[in-house]
């Protein structure tokens, strides 16, 4: 229904709190580079003209579109040319088009520092001063850096934060308290982050029909009892609300998903028998408990795929008077009988159905033609199967250092004119792929291997997107977004490669390195290690290995002498003398 | 909506000739391969021939080949069906189907092979 004022609308569906937490998303999201100080106080107008329109419907400009109120506040900021270049020039333009503006100019890689823990009893104190500050810092600071992240749910981690703070803030040991559970919350908010971020890429580059058909799978596989009408209309609900939030529509994103979970709570019976346990609990946890709920119970008679999708005599005539919905019937009935398949390697068999059906359909004897389709599918499916077993056979064999390492070496050989920080972040997240899918059961490893990569890959595409220097790289990121993984695995050394010139200073380190915390360590071994491998790309398994032990042995030795700056400095040059000589 | 209209059925005397029609719609006409089967009174679906999408690929069921031609013209969207030499035996509602269908879509349309 239509309401005279959007934002009186909005501000009464979500109240004050969700209302502010999602206007300072969306100006961070838009606005990266501004201080938490400025945004905050933008917020506090938007949501006091807001609290007017709600006295009053009628009351001047209460009846604007949002786009047009926010934007007409983040085109008001002073000294906005100075400080975002041509961004300025979005706001010559009329809505729509200065939305669309501001989009394209979000920065998935922006220059800012990274994102400090301040230490236990600091952000204890400022957290008990002011909480409500305290939250918006973070954010700020977290959608600042992740101009697409899936803005209802980082009030989920805001809240799962504040009640980690809530909780350690009150212990004698608040460090041990507070640095596992902040740990867990920042690794599953990155892959919150990087999963969202492919579903807007989806979104943008294959519009809605392709972000729908990912909802498809997705959802028949979790709900295998609902029917298709009713994985139809969730796909639909879903898609809008992914394409609000995709598209900066944040409030009414964060509305649309609270109506789809209250749909979900309303309807368990004809959707699935497990989502009491969610329906049970308050809203942002709730709709985050749904969007991950676990597989319900798949129908134990379920017919052969084969009997509606091959030997039926109406196949064509099915798909002629239906496209779309005969093809969405097929991914449907495939993916609830596949929970064990990653939805990429679910939408890859649709296509090649859709691809046989366009063939045969048009021949003279179809059934004769589509008769194989099913045994055409195997190569697809152990592909991916294959890609698994290796994968984690080498990370059970390595861990996940040595696994980010072998990672890293294969695809600085496959791109190696990618910059070292983009190839050496690619191959740590990557490699985190083995801690967090090889210990799974063997059933849920194929889908959690190959969507995890699959959007690692998504942000690789990204980042290269905007400086493009690698052939291979721009090949696979070309494509659809299903056939990305597969393309990228199947890249070998690139042989257009000239080896880049051995610098010593490169591999020239200082007894700094030695305070580093470990996370900090590996990436200094990490970005050498990448850099060997441009200078030799043919250097062999064996040989970087030993380069690397040497490496690993100096950095000890040093790190525990007495003089560690003397060390660094008659040993390093030692070092990269018996690496040169190594890898000769 | 997929729509298939058949025409041109009548009564015939034997040996002689009919020319079928079959006007579709509602669909990518070039993308499928398109079929005539029949109905005899009293019996099932029998196919009777295919044609591909392109026309360049034609079927016919043993007991018609030699007497009936199946052709298309893609720019009208429609399929036909030359009948030569009918016999009594060739008697049946006539109906056209996409692919390999042997299902009734349109009306269909009455042949009767009479003396």
């Known amino acids: 229904e239509a309401h005279k004022s959007e934002i009186a609308h909005r501000y009464n569906d979500l109240g004050e709190q969700h209302f502010k937490g999602l206007v300072l998303i969306a100006f961070s999201q838009y606005l990266q580079k501004c201080s938490y100080d400025e945004h905050a106080k933008l917020v506090q107008e938007v949501t006091d003209f807001a609290k007017t329109c709600v006295a009053d419907e009628s009351a001047a400009n209460c009846d604007k579109s949002l786009h047009t109120l926010f934007g007409d506040k983040l085109c008001a900021i002073p000294n906005l040319r100075e400080n975002y270049g041509e961004l300025a020039d979005c706001c010559t333009k009329q809505e729509p088009e200065r939305n669309e503006c501001f989009l394209q100019h979000k920065d998935d890689n922006p220059s800012l520092p990274p994102f400090e823990r301040p230490e236990a009893e600091a952000m204890c104190t400022s957290f008990k001063e002011n909480p409500t500050t305290f939250m918006g810092h973070y954010l700020h600071e977290v959608a600042r850096r992740h101009p697409y992240f899936y803005a209802p749910e980082l009030l989920y981690y805001a809240e799962q934060y504040n009640e980690i703070l809530t909780q350690c803030c009150a212990e004698a040991d608040k460090e041990s308290c507070l640095t596992p559970k902040l740990d867990g919350v920042k690794e599953k908010a990155l892959v919150s982050s990087v999963r969202q971020r492919m579903k807007c890429s989806s979104m943008q580059k294959f519009g809605e029909r392709a972000f729908k058909a990912w909802a498809v799978a997705r959802l028949s596989q979790t709900f295998p009892n609902a029917d298709f009408a009713e994985i139809t209309k969730l796909a639909t609900d879903l898609t809008k609300v992914n394409k609000e939030c995709c598209h900066g529509d944040l409030l009414e994103c964060a509305d649309d998903r609270a109506e789809l979970a209250k749909y979900m709570c309303e309807n368990q019976a004809t959707i699935s028998s497990k989502l009491q346990t969610c329906c049970d609990k308050p809203l942002l946890k709730k709709a985050h408990c749904l969007s991950e709920v676990e597989h319900d119970t798949m129908p134990a008679d379920l017919p052969a795929i084969a009997a509606d999708f091959v030997e039926d005599q109406e196949v064509c005539k099915n798909y002629a008077e239906a496209k779309d919905v005969f093809l969405g019937t097929f991914l449907y009935e495939y993916s609830r009988r596949h929970p064990d398949y990653s939805v990429s390697l679910l939408l890859r068999l649709a296509k090649k159905y859709e691809a046989t059906l366009e063939k045969c359909c048009a021949e003279a004897n179809p059934p004769a033609c589509y008769g194989t389709v099913l045994a055409e599918f195997q190569p697809l499916v152990e592909e991916p199967k294959n890609l698994v077993k290796t994968n984690c056979d080498l990370y059970e064999k390595l861990g996940e250092y040595g696994f980010q390492n072998a990672i890293l070496v294969r695809y600085t050989q496959k791109a190696p004119q990618v910059s070292t920080p983009t190839l050496v972040e690619a191959a740590r997240n990557l490699g985190r792929v083995g801690t967090k899918c090889c210990t799974l059961p063997e059933d849920q490893r194929l889908p959690c291997v190959e969507d995890y990569l699959s959007a690692i890959l998504n942000r690789v595409c990204l980042l290269h997107e905007k400086t493009p220097v690698s052939e291979h790289v721009t090949k696979c990121c070309s494509g659809s977004l299903v056939e990305r993984r597969p393309c990228f695995s199947a890249l070998t050394v690139d042989e257009t490669y000239v080896p880049k010139e051995f610098k010593a200073e490169t591999f020239t380190f200082h007894s700094d390195i030695c305070t580093l915390p470990e996370k900090e360590k590996q990436i200094k071994k990490q970005t050498a290690l990448a850099e060997l491998v441009k200078h030799k790309p043919k250097a062999t398994a064996e040989q970087l290995k030993t380069v690397m032990d040497d490496f690993a042995q100096f950095l000890d030795t040093c790190c525990k002498a007495a003089d560690k700056d003397t060390c660094f400095s008659t040993e390093g040059p030692n070092l990269v003398t018996r690496c040169k000589d190594a890898l000769a | 909506d997929v729509q298939l209209v058949e025409s041109g059925g009548g009564v015939v005397q034997p040996g002689n000739s009919l020319r079928l029609s079959c006007a579709a719609s509602?669909?990518?006409?070039?993308?499928?391969?398109m079929s005539w089967v029949r109905q005899a009174p009293g019996k099932g679906l029998e196919w009777v021939s295919s044609i591909s999408g392109s026309g360049s690929d034609t079927l016919y069921a043993d007991s018609v080949k030699g007497r009936f031609t199946i052709s298309r013209d893609n720019a009208k969207t429609t399929l036909y069906l030359q009948m030569n030499s009918l016999r009594p035996e060739d008697t049946a509602l006539y109906y056209c189907?996409?692919?390999?269908?042997?299902?009734?879509s349109g009306q269909g349309t009455l042949v009767t092979v009479s003396s």
């Open positions: 189907t996409i692919g390999g269908s042997l299902s009734r």
């Open positions: 509602g669909f990518t006409f070039t993308s499928f391969g």
